[in-house]
Interface confidence: medium
């Protein structure tokens, strides 16, 4: 349905805090470096401008597209070719190539300091002289880190940020209170952020029938009860929702959101029985709560697959008709019978289906060709489901912080070339899936781990594109979505690797080592891992332990010293000459 | 929500002939299974004609209308036909066209059970 302002028909639809809060976010994600404040009048001027064509919607400019008009704006900025180079090129452009030109200069890693959390009685007093400012800057400070970010889904964060001060702010423990819920809301924020880079990646990089294949597998693993129209229907809207917030179309995403959100609560019956006290949630979080909801029971006496999808010898037939619905359709009827299987994997059996029936139908007996295709899945399935029991066991016996270092030795090894602080990211998050999956049972462990891999990776595939070294990434990360963890982890040592020149620099520590948290002290531990795995990528296990354990007491050795900065100079290059014996 | 819309109905003398129309408003129209039924005055709903889910596949018929009605798709259109031939005052009726989801296989069913939506219907009135 067309309005003759879309800008008036948003405004309308979302509410002035909602508008303001997405244009925030929209132009902080676009322009990563500019200031708040800048950003504050940007938002402001945009808004007043609003009110003009919600007043009068044939006002001059109200018709122009909320591209055109967002674009205008952010070409105002004074310092835009200064702060971003060849970015202000986009300027120069007319829509959409404007808008392109503006997405493909969003950056995954932007140059900026990383928050530092003020004390508690300083956020306080911020927050009680003024709450709206304080909020803002909450959401332009977290767009700019994640130019990604679900937007409707920040403004949900950035109420429970509002929430947490206001209980706690008036706490007699103000600390106590507070910091665990804005480490809880760092943390949520993070993998929300990790998730929709996927997502993004997914629509960008592979397509919309890419994601709406794990769109399909995945709400037909929330929903079986569900059938598979009403499952293509939730697809086809969640795939509008996504792409709109991927292309930087935030007020469209969160409109589009709002409507899906009315139309499954409106709709509960015949999708899911869990909906019930999402809906009874205000706006944001009912939203939330839809996104996040569990698995619907599956319903009792679900027929074989095979009778239709193997046995019958109409499997060819139907497949011309129309592949995707088949295939679709095959997927959905997958999903809902295994909740106990990765997204991933779920895609990869309909990948390997699809195959068999280009080949099979292709034959002179297509039947007799397809008749073993659910045999061939057995390997598939098993790969990860061994993958997920070795992985657990050795998190069981090493614990979080040891089982982090060996990912970090094994990723090393297999892609020296990758930057020592995107392998220290990379695999400690990596070695999160431990705590994080490895507790759950075994119906949940797959579906927890692997997806959770799937994001971790993508995180390495958007931060190598952007400095690419490595053909080996490269491949794993652009060939098949759906395969980018076997890729990974099916890679060996890199014989190809020329060793990284030795420098002391690099392993010489200095007192400050000893007032690091205990977070920050694992990351220097680690980069030192890094570092000497790229030093002597044939390095064994023992001596890389050894070489560690000298290190741990070498540190503990030195902070508990009375002239730790003397200690650390003397015991230092005692340290390294003994490393380098260690693994010569 | 999905729309289900008949058009086509209509009077006609006995022995001519009729084609209902039946448009679906979502592409994903291809995966399920469409069944045309009838209510003539003071009767119960009764099963006319289905077709499974992709063009190429089954289509049943009620002993009634065997060798006289034809159901056909076209799937790029959203729209299912009932091409009606040879008329009879006994085939005047209220038809409704249906749309099923019962999976897997989408085959059509008899059962008005077997089907979700359902459109506002189309008079077909056969004069002798």
């Known amino acids: 349905d067309t309005h003759k302002s879309e800008v008036a028909h948003r405004f309308k639809d979302l509410g002035e805090e909602h508008f303001k809060g997405l244009v925030l976010v929209a132009f902080s994600q676009y322009l990563q470096q500019c200031p708040f404040e800048e950003h504050v009048k940007l938002v402001n001027e945009v808004t007043e401008f609003a009110k003009t064509c919600v007043a009068d919607e044939s006002a001059e400019n109200c018709d122009k597209s909320l591209h055109t008009l967002f674009g205008d704006k952010l070409c105002t900025v004074a310092t835009l070719r200064e702060t971003y180079g060849e970015m202000a090129d986009c300027c120069a452009k007319q829509e959409p190539e404007r808008n392109e030109c503006f997405l493909q200069h969003k950056d995954d890693n932007p140059n900026l300091p990383p928050l530092v959390r003020p004390e508690v009685d300083v956020m306080c007093t911020a927050f009680h002289d003024n709450e709206a400012t304080f909020l803002k800057k909450y959401l332009y400070e977290v767009a700019r880190r994640h130019p990604y970010f679900y937007a409707p889904e920040l403004l949900f964060f950035a109420a429970r940020y509002k929430a947490a001060f206001a209980e706690c702010c008036q706490a007699a423990d103000k600390a106590a209170c507070l910091l665990p819920k804005l480490d809880e809301l760092r943390d949520e924020g993070k993998a929300s952020s990790a998730k929709q880079r996927l997502k993004c990646a997914s629509l960008q990089k592979f397509g919309d029938r890419a994601f709406k294949a794990w769109a399909v597998a995945r709400l037909s693993q929330k929903f079986p009860k569900a059938e598979f129209a009403e499952v293509s229907k939730l697809v086809t809207d969640l795939t509008k929702v996504h792409t709109e917030c991927c292309h930087g179309d935030l007020l469209e995403c969160a409109d589009d959101r709002a409507d899906l959100a009315k139309y499954m609560c409106e709709n509960q019956d015949s999708i899911s029985s869990k909906l019930k006290e999402c809906c009874d949630k205000p706006l944001l979080e009912k939203s939330h709560c839809l996104a996040e909801v569990e698995n619907d029971e599956m319903p009792a006496d679900l027929p074989s697959l095979a009778a239709d999808y193997v046995e019958s010898k109409d499997v060819c037939k139907n497949y011309a008709e129309a592949k995707d619905v088949f295939l679709g359709m095959f997927l959905y009827e997958y999903a809902r019978r295994h909740p106990d299987y990765s997204v991933m994997l779920l895609l990869r059996l309909a990948k390997a289906y699809e195959a068999t029936l280009e080949k099979c139908c292709a034959a002179a007996d297509p039947h007799e060709c397809y008749a073993k295709v659910f045999d061939e899945f057995q390997p598939l399935v098993e790969e990860p489901q061994n993958l997920v029991k070795q992985n657990c066991e050795l998190f069981e016996q090493l614990g979080e912080y040891k089982f982090q270092n060996a990912l970090l030795v094994r990723y090393t090894k297999k892609v020296p070339q990758v930057s020592t602080p995107t392998l220290v990211e990379v695999s400690r998050n990596l070695g999160k899936v431990g705590a994080k999956c490895c507790k759950l049972p075994e119906a949940k462990r797959m579906p927890c781990a692997e997806d959770y891999l799937s994001v971790v990776l993508n995180r390495l595939c958007v931060l190598h594109e952007k400095t690419p070294v490595s053909e080996k990434v490269t491949k794993c990360c652009t060939e098949s979505l759906v395969n980018r963890r076997p890729c990974f982890s099916a890679l060996e040592l890199d014989e190809a690797y020329v060793p990284k020149a030795f420098n002391a620099e690099t392993f010489t520590f200095h007192a400050d080592m000893c007032t690091l948290s205990e977070k920050e002290k694992q990351v220097k531990k680690q980069t030192a891992l890094v570092e000497l795995v790229k030093h002597k990528p044939k390095a064994t296990k023992e001596q890389l332990k050894g070489v560690m354990d000298n290190f741990a007491a070498f540190v503990e050795k030195c902070c508990k010293a009375d002239d730790k900065e003397a200690c650390f100079a003397e015991e230092g290059p005692k340290f390294v000459a003994a490393s380098q014996a260690a693994l010569a | 929500q999905l729309q289900v819309v008949e058009s086509g109905g209509g009077l006609v003398q006995a022995g001519g002939s009729l084609r209902l129309s039946c448009a679906a408003s979502?592409?994903?129209?291809?995966?399920?299974?469409m069944g045309w039924f009838r209510q003539a005055p003071e009767k119960e709903r009764e099963f006319v004609a289905g077709i499974s889910w992709f063009a190429g596949a089954t289509t049943d018929y009620a002993d009634s209308v065997e060798g006289r009605f034809t159901i056909s798709r076209d799937n790029a259109k959203n729209t299912a036909y009932l091409q009606m031939n040879n008329l009879k005052p006994e085939d005047t009726a209220v038809y409704y066209c249906?749309?099923?989801?019962?999976?897997?296989?989408?085959?059509?069913?008899?059962?008005?059970?077997?089907?979700?939506?359902w459109g506002h219907g189309t008079q077909v009135t056969v004069s002798s």
């Open positions: 249906a749309i099923s989801h019962q999976l897997p296989g989408g085959r059509p069913g008899r059962d008005m059970d077997s089907y979700s939506y």
């Open positions: 979502e592409r994903t129209f291809v995966a399920y299974a």
